[in-house]
């Protein structure tokens, strides 16, 4: 069964900078990736970036740079302009879509005990919701 993993990392040198890493574990090719924060895509989350494997990326503040790391993983750099570092308590979600086979989404956040520069373990945190025939979690 395909899975999505999410890691959130605080930069050691810039405490206001975070990077979200997401990857897809499974067969098939990815047609689109969406990254959101504050909840899952289409369920209260706010869009941060959309990445197409061939046609480029689109991103919205506070996203700074979205890019493909491999054919099945992406990274999103975020710049936190606020002094209170709200990213530390925020949930980030990544959805990998493979048309028309299905889409898979997981969420993750920076662990409360994280030291700067340490990343969260790559454990997928499935979003539980009513299943929809091609949306697998």
């Amino acid at each position: 069964t395909p899975e999505v993993w999410v890691q959130v990392q605080m930069e050691a040198t810039e405490l206001s900078s975070f990077t979200v890493h997401c990857g897809f574990l499974g067969p098939g090719s990815i047609s689109l990736v969406t990254v959101s924060w504050g909840g899952p895509d289409g369920a209260g989350g706010t869009k941060l970036a959309v990445l197409h494997p061939e046609l480029g990326t689109r991103q919205w503040a506070p996203a700074r740079q979205a890019r493909w790391e491999t054919q099945s993983s992406i990274s999103l750099a975020l710049e936190d302009s606020g002094a209170s570092s709200p990213f530390a308590n925020t949930t980030f979600c990544c959805k990998f879509a493979s048309f028309p086979e299905g889409s898979w989404e997981s969420c993750g956040s920076l662990p409360p005990s994280s030291d700067p520069g340490l990343s969260a373990p790559p454990t997928p945190v499935p979003i539980l919701r009513a299943d929809h025939h091609h949306h697998h979690h």
Partner: nanobody, 121 residues
């Protein structure tokens, strides 16, 4: 979460017509385009049969221009595809999808289970 439900597919003779409908519900729509897609035979990427973006720009695949018409119903979350002068090569599973525009093309982010269109000669 998103629920995109298509209807209107079926079997028809060449030259006939069908009207596909799509209703989106339970969806906090944050994309910028919607459309009808098919998995084109022999192609790795999806083919946008007919798409419409938030600015009202409509785009058709060359193979359906002049025969198919995409339109919104009463509200943003109802989409139609009027298919006229159908040909056997139009036979496929048709998916209603919401997505994002890249380079003028709508790329699906969410889609329904599809509705089968079969055109016999």
């Amino acid at each position: 979460h998103v629920q995109l439900v298509e209807s209107g597919g079926g079997s028809v003779q060449a030259g006939g017509s069908l009207r596909l409908s799509c209703e989106a519900s339970g969806y906090s729509y944050s994309g910028d385009c919607m459309g009808w897609f098919r998995r084109a035979p022999g192609k790795e990427r999806d083919e946008g049969v007919a798409t419409i973006d938030n600015a009202g720009r409509i785009k058709y695949a060359d193979s359906v221009k002049g025969r198919f018409t995409i339109s919104h119903g009463n509200g943003k979350y109802i989409l139609y595809l009027q298919m006229n002068s159908l040909k056997p090569e139009d036979t496929d599973m048709y998916y209603c999808a919401a997505g994002w525009t890249f380079g003028g093309n709508c790329s699906p982010a969410d889609w329904g289970q599809g509705t089968q269109v079969t055109v016999s000669s």
